[in-house]
C-alpha cells in the first residue's frame, strides 16, 4: 500500500487561477501542433489494474517523466507558457518526492513504461502530444492526489 500521507497534494495547488490557466493554455497550444489524434497517452488504460490508493504514486511517475524527458528538452517551445508552467509542475513533483509505495509496484511501472515507450516511439511528435495532454495530467494529478 502507498505511504498515503506522503502521496498527497493540497487542494490549493489546483485552485490557483493564473497558473491553472497557463497550464491549460500551454496544453492547447501544443495540441494545435499535434497531428496524431489517434493516440492518447493519459487515459483509462494508464490506470488499468491500479487501485485508487496507488494512483497518486502512478501520476507522480508520469509527472516526473513528463518533466525530465519532455518539458525540459522542449523548454524553448510554446513560450511564454512553458517558462511559467514548468516551475509549477516541478514544485508539485518536489512535493511528491516522498510518495512511495511499499511492496511490488511492477504493475504501475508496466503501465507507465507503455506511456514512455509511446512517447519515445513517436519522437518529437510524442513530446508535443505529452505537452498537449498537460490538462489531462493536471486533472489526473488533482483527482489522484488531493
Amino acid at each position: 500500500a502507498p505511504i498515503s500521507s506522503h502521496c498527497r497534494l493540497d487542494k490549493s495547488n489546483f485552485q490557483q487561477p493564473y497558473i491553472t490557466n497557463r497550464t491549460f493554455m500551454l496544453a492547447k497550444e501544443a495540441s494545435l501542433a499535434d497531428n496524431n489524434t489517434d493516440v492518447r497517452l493519459i487515459g483509462e488504460k494508464l490506470f488499468h489494474g491500479v487501485s485508487m490508493s496507488e494512483r497518486c504514486y502512478l501520476m507522480k511517475q508520469v509527472l516526473n517523466f513528463t518533466l525530465e524527458e519532455v518539458l525540459f528538452p522542449q523548454s524553448d517551445r510554446f513560450q511564454p507558457y512553458m517558462q511559467e508552467v514548468v516551475p509549477f509542475l516541478a514544485r508539485l513533483s518536489n512535493r511528491l518526492s516522498t510518495c512511495h509505495i511499499e511492496g511490488d509496484d511492477l504493475h504501475i511501472q508496466r503501465n507507465v513504461q507503455k506511456l514512455k515507450d509511446t512517447v519515445k516511439k513517436l519522437g518529437e511528435s510524442g513530446e508535443i502530444k505529452a505537452i498537449g495532454e498537460l490538462d489531462l495530467l493536471f486533472m489526473s494529478l488533482r483527482n489522484a492526489c488531493i
Partner: antibody, heavy 119, light 107 residues
Framework: QVQLVESGGGLVKPGGSLRLSCAAS????????MSWIRQAPGKGLEWVSA????????YYADSVKGRITISRDNAKNSLYLQMNSLRAEDTAVYYC????????????WGRGTLVTVSS | DIQMTQSPSTLSASVGDRVTITCRAS??????LAWYQQKPGKAPKLLIY???SLASGVPSRFSGSGSGTEFTLTISSLQPDDFATYYC?????????FGGGTKVEIK
C-alpha cells in the same frame, strides 16, 4: 463510420422494468466511456449514467440511483441500461453516446429510443 | 453537483446576425465545457469541446470562449441551417450536467 443504435424502448406501466440496448460499430468500443442521456418530451438533456471502457467504473445521476444499472459487453460491442421501478417522470427519449475518457466530450450520439411510462 | 445556467432561453435572430449564447457554471470547471446543437427529432451534435476547440466538420462560423465559470458560444453570421437549440455541458466532474438550452429561432 461511427454508429450507435439504441433499441428496447416502448410503453411500460409505472413500477415496471425495461432493458435498453445500444449497438456500437465503426470504432474500438472497449476504448470508450459510454453514457446514457435522456430527454423528456419538450425538455432539455439530462445525463443518466456512464460506464468506463473496461466496465470497471460506473456513474449515475442521483435521480436514477438504485433503480437503474448500466452495463456493457465489449465482446458484443453493446451497451445496456436496465431500468427498474419506472416512474412517469422517466418518460423520455434515451440516447447512448460515447466519450473517450472522463475528460472528453460526447462526440457521437445515437438517434435515441423512446420510453413511455404510463398506466 | 455542478449547475449549468444558460442564457437566454430563447433568442430571435435573422440570417447574417452575430449570435452569442452564455453559459455559467456554479463552480470552476477549467475548460471542460462542450456545446451541442440539436434539431427537432434529432440527436444532439457536438460543436465545441474544451470550451473553444471546434469539433470535426463544424463550420468556422461557430466559436467558443471562456474558462472557469463563464463561457460563450458565438455564431459569427447566422445561417438558415443554424436555427436549432443549443446546449452547454460540463465534463469536469460526474455527474455530467447540461445547461437548460437556448432555442435560436427566426425573427
Amino acid at each position: 463510420q461511427v454508429q450507435l443504435v439504441e433499441s428496447g424502448g416502448g410503453l411500460v406501466k409505472p413500477g415496471g422494468s425495461l432493458r435498453l440496448s445500444c449497438a456500437a460499430s465503426g470504432f474500438t468500443f472497449s476504448d470508450y466511456y459510454m453514457s446514457w442521456i435522456r430527454q423528456a418530451p419538450g425538455k432539455g438533456l439530462e445525463w443518466v449514467s456512464a460506464i468506463s471502457g473496461s466496465g470497471g467504473s460506473t456513474y449515475y445521476a442521483d435521480s436514477v440511483k438504485g433503480r437503474i444499472t448500466i452495463s456493457r459487453d465489449n465482446a458484443k460491442n453493446s451497451l445496456y441500461l436496465q431500468m427498474n421501478s419506472l416512474r412517469a417522470e422517466d418518460t423520455a427519449v434515451y440516447y447512448c453516446a460515447r466519450g473517450l475518457w472522463v475528460w472528453d466530450p460526447l462526440d457521437y450520439w445515437g438517434r435515441g429510443t423512446l420510453v413511455t411510462v404510463s398506466s | 453537483d455542478i449547475q449549468m445556467t444558460q442564457s437566454p432561453s430563447t433568442l430571435s435572430a435573422s440570417v447574417g446576425d452575430r449570435v452569442t449564447i452564455t453559459c455559467r457554471a456554479s463552480e470552476g470547471i477549467y475548460h471542460w465545457l462542450a456545446w451541442y446543437q440539436q434539431k427537432p427529432g434529432k440527436a444532439p451534435k457536438l460543436l465545441i469541446y474544451k470550451a473553444s476547440s471546434l469539433a470535426s466538420g463544424v463550420p468556422s462560423r461557430f466559436s467558443g470562449s471562456g474558462s472557469g465559470t463563464e463561457f460563450t458560444l458565438t455564431i459569427s453570421s447566422l445561417q438558415p441551417d443554424d436555427f436549432a437549440t443549443y446546449y452547454c455541458q460540463q465534463y469536469s466532474n460526474y455527474p455530467l450536467t447540461f445547461g437548460g438550452g437556448t432555442k435560436v429561432e427566426i425573427k
